[in-house]
Interface confidence: low
Amino acid sequence: EEELQVIQPEKSVSVAAGDSATLNCTVSSLIPVGPIQWFRGAGPGRELIYNLKEGHFPRVTPVSDPTKRNNMDFSIRISNITPADAGTYYCVKFRKGSPDVELKSGAGTELSVRAKPSAPVVSGPAVRATAEHTVSFTCESHGFSPRDITLKWFKNGNELSDVQTNVDPAGKSVSYSIRSTARVVLTRRDVHSQVICEVAHVTLQGDPLRGTANLSEAIRVPPFLEVTQQSMRADNQVNVTCQVTKFYPQRLQLTWLENGNVSRTEMASALPENKDGTYNWTSWLLVNVSAHRDDVKLTCQVEHDGQPAVNKSFSVKVSAHPKEQGSNTAAENTGTNERNIY
């Protein structure tokens, strides 16, 4: 009798996740009598994929009717392929018996699954940083196959170069993950800036996936402080102004101190945004000069976003009154922790 051949014509098949895969198998002879079974993998740990006689294989259907007389086509179709289905599939002929005896195996067809990467997820630093500091953003995407993938970082459309990227695992796997870290140097103008992680993969047909992060969630822009005195009014009241400018985020508390004693505390809220995303705030204090014998030391103390307070002080010269003082006199910068931390 002619020697039985089990023919698996394709050495490999590549399928997109979610599609169906057809694994072809024909036999050269109807003799000897016995079933065909499909396995994934070889050796004792192989996994039964399809057995016409028994079992429930909801995703596997025969391509032609295997119950037909003289059928020699034992090709199967596996629906809704996932990366977990990747592997080498063997069509195996058994000789009928008790039990059936394995007679011959096909050469095997390697099924590789093209799986899209998941949407890139970008995460930023846990705490805010100020301008000139470097912060790290991480981008992750999972579940793609094959392993070849390209990841790029952009800040406001410009590609970033300080990037470290890893694809895992290093060896063969049904699917892969990519993790990339980009280091970004912040500037005061970055409140409206955005970083984008762009992932390109063969399954995306030229339309890369993007994940974004707003630098507004990673940056702190400390305020500039300026204290000025306006002209004295006819009622012996001096209007002293504290201008707090160019800060972000909006969380800010301002305290006025007269000769070291708290006079008033205010919280910033519902401020209009500058074009660059920062905020300005002006607070003023009316000082009744006639109520004081000595010069009055006024301090504008600002706590921004939970950071240590920054002070600006100004002395109102009582001796110079009741005549008018020169208007818009800039304040001296005195006291502790009063460096302009920009």
Partner: antibody, heavy 123, light 107 residues
């Protein structure tokens, strides 16, 4: 600033229908899938399904097929949940929640949530 | 469906304490797990995604760990604003499912 802004509370009679809206602000609606989550009074969170905002294709969880319809109006950046033939057991807060990408069909973490819409069904 | 079981259902702690909430999945969900915080009358807030990564703006006292079926959310140095209900959620397989919640109360 990214926000999902939902319509206000509704009081309905059994058998009536209700339509809850969820407006996306600060990002492009069609870039992210929109999920719907139910929270009955004093209970936990229950995922109802999502709508692929790019194709408009809805996916419903098992208990939410039939009377529940997800839809979109991309011209006003809004997703909708419509519930028909209301029952007392539909009384709950309904949340819309954004998933990080419509191309990730195995769902994802919900990074932004609407403020919730209380639907009360009572005769 | 994948069942997500949180423990404990509730716990009492004091400001400054370190607390751990666990979440167990009935099947392997890889690292497709998120944690949310919900305060009474408010919508849930995303804390952690992919089992371990904090969203931007989430304080570093919140940390996640685990993979497969066993996950934990740890809050170190509890603050007054941390008293809330916490939910885990798997997003590995449809339907997406949440844990029943853990109510963290002030002692």
């Amino acid at each position: 600033q990214i926000q999902l802004v939902q319509s206000g509370s509704e009081l309905k009679k059994p058998g009536a229908s209700v339509k809850v809206s969820c407006r996306a602000r600060g990002y492009t609606l069609t870039d992210y899938a929109m999920n719907w989550v139910r929270q009955a009074p004093g209970q936990g969170l229950e995922w109802m399904g999502f709508i692929n905002t790019y194709t408009g294709e809805p996916t419903y969880a098992q208990g939410f097929k039939g009377r529940f319809v997800f839809s979109l109006d991309t011209s006003v950046s809004t997703a909708y949940l419509q519930i028909g033939s209301l029952k007392a057991e539909d009384t709950a807060v309904y949340y819309c929640a954004r998933t990080r990408g419509y191309y990730d069909f195995d769902g994802g973490a919900f990074d932004y949530w609407g403020q919730g819409t209380l639907v009360t069904v009572s005769s | 469906d994948i069942q997500m079981t949180q423990s404990p259902s509730s716990l009492s702690a004091s400001v400054g304490d370190r607390v751990t909430i666990t979440c167990r999945a009935s099947q392997n969900v890889g690292t497709h797990l998120a944690w949310y915080q919900q305060k009474p009358g408010k919508s849930p807030k995303a804390l952690i995604f992919s089992a371990i990564y904090r969203y931007i703006g989430v304080p570093s006292r919140f940390s996640g760990s685990g993979s497969g079926t066993d996950f934990t959310l740890t809050i170190s140095n509890l603050q007054p604003e941390d008293f809330a209900t916490y939910y885990c959620q798997q997003y590995n397989t449809y339907p997406l499912t949440f844990g029943q919640g853990t109510k963290l109360e002030i002692k």
